[in-house]
């Protein structure tokens, strides 16, 4: 039975040209995290494998940095970066946990972070 929950940075906003940290945290489970995948809508951005370390998609290497921790740092933000981001935790023996973050990239300096919130665990992505 899957007992875990994923806490994420929730709905966040940032300024165009700036950077933002996407963070997820898996709690309430003793399952072993084997890999974390970061996805932007329908694109795979990065993989952090417990045995093999971080690997960033070649098409995003110039703007995506690993960390801190299992999080992901997006740099040189553009308005096109606005949208949904997913952290997918592959765990043993539980299976897959998915967290969702919505990022809005703003032209002005009105950007501010949303409150942290919890997403109930679920097995299927999207």
């Amino acid at each position: 039975m899957m007992t875990g929950t994923i806490e994420t940075t929730g709905n966040i906003s940032a300024e165009k040209g700036g950077s933002i940290i996407l963070q997820c945290h898996l709690s309430s489970t003793t399952a072993q995290v084997t890999q974390v995948n970061w996805e932007q809508q329908d694109q795979l951005l990065a993989i952090c494998n417990a045995d093999l370390g971080w690997h960033i998609s070649p098409s995003f290497k110039d703007r995506v940095a690993p960390g801190p921790g299992l999080g992901l740092t997006l740099q040189s933000l553009t308005v096109n970066d606005t949208g949904e981001y997913f952290c997918i935790y592959h765990t043993y023996p539980d299976g897959t946990y998915t967290g969702r973050i919505f990022l809005e990239v703003l032209e002005s300096s009105v950007a501010e972070h949303g409150a942290r919130f919890q997403i109930p665990h679920h097995h299927h992505h999207h």
Epitope: T34, Q35, N37, E39, D42, Q43, L44, I47, N49, D51, L52, G53, H55, I56, S57, P58, S59, H90, H124, H125, H126
Partner: antibody, heavy 117, light 107 residues
Framework: EVQLVQSGAEVKKPGASVKVSCKAS????????IEWVRQAPGQRLEWMGV????????NYKEKFKGRVTITADKSSSTAYMELSSLRSEDTAVYYC??????????WGQGTTVTVSS | DIVMTQSPDSLAVSLGERATINCKAS??????VAWYQHKPGQSPKLLIY???YRYTGVPDRFSGSGSGTDFTLTISSLQAEDVAVYYC?????????FGGGTKVEIK
Amino acid sequence: EVQLVQSGAEVKKPGASVKVSCKASGYAFTNYLIEWVRQAPGQRLEWMGVINPGSGGTNYKEKFKGRVTITADKSSSTAYMELSSLRSEDTAVYYCARGEYFFFDYWGQGTTVTVSS
Amino acid sequence: DIVMTQSPDSLAVSLGERATINCKASQHVSTGVAWYQHKPGQSPKLLIYSASYRYTGVPDRFSGSGSGTDFTLTISSLQAEDVAVYYCQQHYNTPHTFGGGTKVEIK
């Protein structure tokens, strides 16, 4: 020029072990993964496992765990794949490949391993 | 393990015509799919990575598309040197499984 040069063909008896080497050149050995893939006659390509030569971290396909060991020697930029308790079904061409983001952009020439009594 | 199912098993196409190969993943793999060309007696060659990115030096008649579970490799105008077996591979999660291969021949 990136190159992966593998050791020569091997003929082994059932129950024996084989160790295949893969010497890398033309790039920073510790900056990329080395993956091992095999192809038995008439079969699809089969991923066996991978090593991060920088950290020494490994990951193996479940069916090979306990029977395969992948190592890397940073000083000689060489990776090794040792498969033990050989059986006839292990007869295959074994490839090493450079792993970039878990896809394989350069491949060795392949090493034929024949298991026969 | 994620199962990659390729179709068709073989394909005969006239020179200059389009060849389309499909690959279906048994579960979501985002854009974590690569395509390889494998000729007899040679090592496989990378054509496409991350579903749609053409690898360096690969002719632009090769293209890839798809996301999630359904992926396609297209050869827009088949050349004689394209005769080979083509494999999809998911690089989303270990073990990094391959499809069964599609043999492309000249009609």
